[in-house]
């Protein structure tokens, strides 16, 4: 049985509301900011984890500017609206009537406008690059070794099935996840690449999302792996939609 | 499902030794930050010590340094702990716990995910 059953905790997200009041004095676990239950067995949408995150106490950050080439996420804050499911809503706005639409990892896909613009689909983000640069060791870690230890921790940690992980490449000090996963390959009850990759930036971040304060602990043959930046690009199943104004800025 | 399972508790003489097993089923061990906590009768449950997922890193309580040696056998997905030189106050309820996958190892029960049921050892003359 898991801790959750004795303390009443959520081991995949620390940013919950936990009680024994589910059936049979079970312990059920809400989502802070939206009060969504959550599978604790599982990982918590990042729709519900932006919110979660935007209802507690924060301090200011810096944005990065997005590539112009592909979306990346720059960390740029939003309460978002999630649906019943805990998935972002196609369409997001803030306080001031501006909208947007958005992917399926929350990313910002289109030009601003205001409460007349229409986001007909959540278009699907079905490959996400995640470029490492890792901070400097004795020698290059082993290829394979680091191949290995990384599809092992998006399985075991993340939950992510291996089908998912479509590669893994590595240049010193370069390390380069792709993952890949198109609508008709995610099964009912599959982790979505966009959950284990927000997941993943987390713990690289130091800002581990699961429970305890142990935060992640990679290693490749017993040698620690500690990255010193981190880059995340999500492709779309259809093209965004920018302005050419935005493009050539 | 994940089921962890704890052997070896039973009565033993001060000064005695025994030697806890914990087995695991349904995880993949040798990814798992492992831990032994324990339960006095009437008291809270305590840290006694940890190790780290790799193996590389263990702690312990300070009220058993130095008597204990915990340990893992990945190939058999099994965590020990041996435990020499037992006194009165070593008597409690020995649980064995696992953390989520990958992750730091932590003293408080809420930095472990998974619980076996306990096995009882008694140090008494």
């Known amino acids: 049985h898991t801790a959750a059953q004795d303390n009443c905790t959520c081991p995949t997200n620390k940013m919950t509301v936990c009680s024994p009041d589910g059936p049979g004095g079970r312990c059920q676990c809400r989502a802070l900011g939206s009060g969504m239950a959550v599978d604790c067995s599982t990982l918590t949408s990042k729709c519900l984890l932006l919110k979660a995150r935007m209802s507690a106490p924060k301090n200011a950050r810096t944005l990065v500017r997005p590539s112009e080439h592909a979306l990346v996420d720059n960390d740029g804050l939003y309460d978002p609206d999630c649906d019943p499911e805990g998935r972002f809503k196609a369409r997001q706005c803030n306080q001031t009537s501006v909208c947007w639409c958005v992917n399926s990892v929350g990313v910002r896909r289109t030009d601003k406008g205001d409460l007349s613009l229409r986001c007909d689909e959540l278009v699907r983000t079905h490959h996400i690059l995640i470029d490492l640069r890792h901070r400097p060791t004795a020698g290059a870690f082993n290829h394979s070794d680091l191949d290995a230890e990384l599809r092992r921790l998006f399985r075991e940690r993340y939950r992510l099935h291996p089908k998912f992980v479509a590669a893994v490449h590595y240049e010193q000090p370069t390390i380069q996840i792709e993952l890949r996963q198109n609508t008709s390959q995610k099964a009912a009850g599959d982790v979505d690449i966009g959950d284990a990759a927000y997941y993943f930036e987390r713990d690289i971040k130091g800002e581990s999302l699961f429970q305890g304060r142990g935060g992640l602990d990679l290693r490749v043959r017993g040698e620690p792996l500690q990255v010193e930046r981190t880059l995340i690009y999500y492709l779309d199943e259809i093209p965004p939609k920018f302005s050419m104004k935005r493009l050539t800025a | 499902q994940v089921q962890l399972l704890e052997s070896g508790g039973g009565l033993v003489q001060p000064g005695g030794s025994l030697r806890l097993s914990c087995a695991l089923s349904?995880?993949?061990?040798?990814?798992?930050?492992m831990a032994w906590f324990r339960q006095p009768p009437g008291q809270e449950r305590e840290f006694v010590a940890d190790m780290s997922w790799s193996g590389t890193n263990t702690y312990y309580a300070d009220s058993v340094k130095g008597r204990f040696t915990i340990s893992r056998d990945n190939s058999k997905n099994t965590l020990y702990l041996q435990m020499n030189s037992l006194r009165a106050e070593d008597t409690a309820v020995y649980y064995c716990?696992?953390?989520?996958?990958?992750?730091?190892?932590?003293?408080?029960?809420?930095?472990?995910?998974?619980w076996g049921q306990g096995t009882l050892v008694t140090v008494s003359s």
């Open positions: 716990a696992a953390g989520w996958p990958y992750s730091g190892t932590g003293r408080s029960t809420t930095d472990y995910t998974y």
């Open positions: 349904g995880l993949t061990f040798n990814t798992y930050p």
